[in-house]
Amino acid sequence: MAVTACQGLGFVVSLIGIAGIIAATCMDQWSTQDLYNNPVTAVFNYQGLWRSCVRESSGFTECRGYFTLLGLPAMLQAVRALMIVGIVLGAIGLLVSIFALKCIRIGSMEDSAKANMTLTSGIMFIVSGLCAIAGVSVFANMLVTNFWMSTANMYTGMGGMVQTVQTRYTFGAALFVGWVAGGLTLIGGVMMCIACRGLAPEETNYKAVSYHASGHSVAYKPGGFKASTGFGSNTKNKKIYDGGARTEDEVQSYPSKHDYV
C-alpha cells in the first residue's frame, strides 16, 4: 500500500513538475526590466527564451520572436537545449511511469517489469528536473553578470546634460516557476526510485513450493492469497512479490481456471 502511494505521489508530483517546466519554457518573463531606478516606467521590457516583449502604459504589448538562430548568445541556446531536453525526458518519463503504476493493470505485466519501469521513469524525472534547474540557473547567472555589468556602465553616455540610461534586467517569474518545477520533478523522480525498491523482488523471498497430487497438481504459494488449480504447466516455481497480485502463471486463457480468495 505504501509502495503504491509513494509511486502514485511521485507520478503526480513529477506530472506537476513537468507541466511547470513546460510552462516556464514557454513563458515570456524570464528576465524583466529592473524598476529600481524608475518604479513608474511607461515602457516595461521583458524577455523569454523565444521572444522579447514590450508592454506600454497604454496597455499595448508588442512581442518579437528571436528569428535568428546563429545570432543568439550561446548561453541562451544552451538554456533552450537544457529546457527542451528536460521536457522530452520528462514526457518520456511520464509515459513510462503510467505503465509502471501499480494501480494500473496492463495485460500480464510482471511486478519486476513494473519495478524496472518505475526506476527508469524515476531516473528520467531526476535528470529532467536537473536539466530544468541547470537551465534556469545558467540563465539566472547570465542575468546577474549582465546586471552588474550594466550597473557599472549605467550612465555611459553622459555628455553634458544628456543621459543614456541602460535598461537593466532582473529575475522574471519564469525563473521561479522553473526552479520550483525542476525541484518538484526531481522530488517526484526520487519518490519513484524509492517506490521501485518496494516493488522490486528480493532474493530473501520464499520460493514457491509445488505439491503434486495424483489427479491434478495444486500449487501452494506461501504468502499468497490465491490457490490455483492447474491443468497445464501452471506449476512452475514463482517468486511472490505481493500476495494479492496476479502472477504470470495464472494464465487467463484457460477457460476452466478459477481463482479462490
Epitope: 526590466q33 524608475n38 513608474v40 516606467t41 511607461a42 515602457v43 521590457n45 521583458y46 524577455q47 522579447s52 516583449c53 514590450v54 506600454e56 502604459s57 497604454s58 496597455g59 499595448f60 508588442e62 518579437r64 553616455g157 544628456v162 543621459q163 543614456t164 540610461v165 541602460q166 535598461t167
Partner: antibody, heavy 118, light 113 residues
Framework: EVMLLESGGGLVQPGGSLRLSCAAS????????MSWVRQAPGKRLEWVAT????????YYPDSVKGRFTISRDNAKNTLYLQMNSLRAEDTAVYYC???????????WGQGTLVTVSS | DIVMTQSPDSLAVSLGERATINCKSS????????????LTWYQQKPGQPPKLLIY???TRESGVPDRFSGSGSGTDFTLTISSLQAEDVAVYYC?????????FGGGTKLEIK
C-alpha cells in the same frame, strides 16, 4: 467617430474641490488607458494623470500628487478627475485623452475650463 | 524628469516650402527592448484640442497626410512638413512618452510667411 466629452469645469475658490468627468463613446473605452492633460492660457501642455485600462495603476506628476485622483467607471464609459486643495496655478483647460500605441495620446476631448480664483 | 526642449519657438515658412521643427530631450527616449523611440508629435490649432500626428518618433498616425514625417533617435528629433499648406498653421508639440512624468516641449508656432 470617437467622442470624448469633458464636463464639470467652472470657477472655484483656492482650496476648493472640483470633479471633472469625461464621457467616452464610439470606442472600446475599457481597453484604453486614459489620461488628463491641462493647458494654462498661452502655456504648454502639461500631463496631469494617467490610469491603466484595468484601473489597477494610476500615475501623477509631483505637482498634483496627493491632491488629484484619477478614476474610471468602465461600465459607464466615464473617466473622472477629483481635484482637491485647488490652487491658482491649477487654472487651465483640462483635456481627457485616450492612450494608443507608443503611449501616444490618440483621442482627445474638447476640454473643460477650470478657473481657480478668489 | 525628462526635459523637452523645442526649437525654434516660432517659424514662418512660405506655402509649399519645407518646415522643420526640432526637439531635444534631456534623456534618451530609445527603448532597448524594441528599438523604438518614445517620442510623440502633436498639432494644436487655435481653440482646438491637440491632434496626434506621429508616435514612436517616425510612425504616422492614420489619417495624417504624408507630408508630415518624423525622424531622429535617442535625444534628437525632427518633425518635417515637406510642403507647407495653409491648414498646417498651428502650434506643434513634442512629448516624452517613454517615462513618467510625461513631459511636453514648449511648442513651436508655425506661421505662413
Amino acid at each position: 467617430e470617437v467622442m470624448l466629452l469633458e464636463s464639470g469645469g467652472g470657477l472655484v475658490q483656492p482650496g476648493g474641490s472640483l470633479r471633472l468627468s469625461c464621457a467616452a463613446s464610439e470606442f472600446t473605452f475599457s481597453n484604453y488607458a486614459m489620461s488628463w492633460v491641462r493647458q494654462a492660457p498661452g502655456k504648454r501642455l502639461e500631463w496631469v494623470a494617467t490610469i491603466s485600462s484595468g484601473r489597477s495603476s494610476t500615475y501623477y506628476p509631483d505637482s498634483v500628487k496627493g491632491r488629484f485622483t484619477i478614476s474610471r467607471d468602465n461600465a459607464k464609459n466615464t473617466l473622472y478627475l477629483q481635484m482637491n486643495s485647488l490652487r491658482a496655478e491649477d487654472t487651465a483647460v483640462y483635456y481627457c485623452a485616450g492612450l494608443g500605441r507608443g503611449n501616444a495620446m490618440e483621442y482627445w476631448g474638447q476640454g473643460t475650463l477650470v478657473t481657480v480664483s478668489s | 524628469d525628462i526635459v523637452m526642449t523645442q526649437s525654434p519657438d516660432s517659424l514662418a515658412v512660405s506655402l509649399g516650402e519645407r518646415a522643420t521643427i526640432n526637439c531635444k530631450s534631456s534623456q534618451s527616449l530609445l527603448n532597448s527592448g524594441n528599438q523604438k523611440n518614445y517620442l510623440t508629435w502633436y498639432q494644436q490649432k487655435p481653440g482646438q484640442p491637440p491632434k496626434l500626428l506621429i508616435y514612436w518618433a517616425s510612425t504616422r498616425e492614420s489619417g495624417v497626410p504624408d507630408r508630415f514625417s518624423g525622424s531622429g533617435s535617442g535625444t534628437d528629433f525632427t518633425l518635417t512638413i515637406s510642403s507647407l499648406q495653409a491648414e498646417d498653421v498651428a502650434v506643434y508639440y513634442c512629448q516624452n512618452a517613454y517615462s513618467y512624468p510625461f513631459t511636453f516641449g514648449g511648442g513651436t508656432k508655425l506661421e505662413i510667411k
